[in-house]
């Protein structure tokens, strides 16, 4: 028989945690596991827990976490990878819409992250999209162009700045910006 | 809310004795590594020791501390200790306790800074000599 399969691992109530909040990680395997190993990725550090409780997330913290499991004298294959973001730890970039936050279907509209750092990552975050939009750029400012707008890209937007020198340690979040398709 | 409460500093003349002592409150205490490290001004926090929950209580002190200090845990009361003996005016410091919330699996893992989560305000100890 092959390896044990991998077990999955998940951030609640989300891997973007705002400085001194808590975030619970849980690694979840089949019934009957011996023992669970939860490691933090390039630190040396580990817990032979299925869950690690943070009572106050810290820059320490923050970093890419996986997990697996042992049955008899098997592991499992590793977790994917869960990347915790630490947010809060920069003042929040500014984000816009041009032309402006009110579009017509099948129109086009940029979103515009702004910040008065030198970073050079991006992220936005639709509210209720579990995946952000990433985008490297130079000049204190991302474009997030969205082609042939639907009515299913309305919606509460937020966007973050960080460093790709510190990929774990982003600002606070952008005031929301509230896209409407007419 | 996470707090490390550090007490016990204070002047002592060289060859003294002190006891600090460290309460923790909002962390789970018995399942993480808790440390003392000390800073002069103007100079990098500097690892003192480490006691963890592993085999009951693994501990480690600096080279510079061995033999003079002991750090130790009450796990029921969350509390950790550090007696500081035989004092001399190099170990004139702001002492800091730390906690980590996970272990360490490589060595000199656990004298790095960047391996602890929790830090306390720190309490001043001065040896007049």
């Known amino acids: 028989s092959g390896p044990l399969p991998k077990p999955s691992l998940q951030a609640l109530p989300s891997s973007l945690v705002p400085l001194e909040k808590p975030v619970t990680l849980r690694c979840q395997g089949p019934p009957g596991v011996d023992l669970y190993r939860l490691e933090k990725l390039s630190s040396s550090r580990y817990q032979d827990q299925a869950v690690l409780f943070i009572p106050a997330m810290k820059r320490s913290l923050a970093g890419r976490y996986r997990c697996s499991y042992q049955q008899g004298s098997l592991w499992s294959l590793p977790s994917d990878q869960l990347e915790l973001v630490a947010t809060g730890v920069f003042a929040k970039p500014s984000l816009s819409a041009q032309p402006g936050p009110a579009v017509s279907s099948g129109g086009d509209v940029t979103l515009q992250c702004q910040t008065r750092y030198g970073f050079d990552q991006f992220a936005l975050y639709k509210e209720g999209d579990p995946a952000p939009y990433k985008n490297p750029e130079r000049w204190y400012r991302a474009s997030f162009p969205i082609i042939t707008v639907t009515a299913a890209h309305s919606g509460t937007y937020r966007c973050y700045s960080f460093s790709s020198r510190d990929p774990y340690l982003w600002s606070a979040p952008s005031d929301p910006l509230e896209l409407v398709v007419t | 809310q996470v707090q490390l409460q550090e007490s016990g500093g204070g002047l002592v003349q060289a060859g003294g004795s002190l006891r600090l002592s460290c309460a923790a409150s909002g962390v789970t205490f018995d399942s993480a590594a808790m440390a003392w490290f000390r800073q002069v001004p103007g100079k990098e926090r500097e690892f003192v020791a480490v006691?963890?929950?592993?085999?009951?209580?693994?501990?480690d002190h600096a080279d510079s501390v061995k033999g003079r200090f002991l750090i130790s845990r009450d796990n029921a009361r969350h509390m950790v200790y550090l007696q500081m003996n035989s004092l001399n005016p190099e170990d004139t410091a702001v002492y800091y306790c730390?906690?980590?919330?996970?272990?360490?699996?490589?060595?000199?893992?656990?004298?790095?800074?960047?391996?602890?989560?929790?830090w306390g305000q720190g309490t001043q100890v001065t040896v007049s000599s």
């Open positions: 730390a906690s980590s919330l996970l272990y360490c699996s490589a060595s000199g893992c656990y004298a790095n800074r960047d391996s602890y989560d929790y």
């Open positions: 006691i963890s929950t592993e085999s009951g209580g693994r501990t």
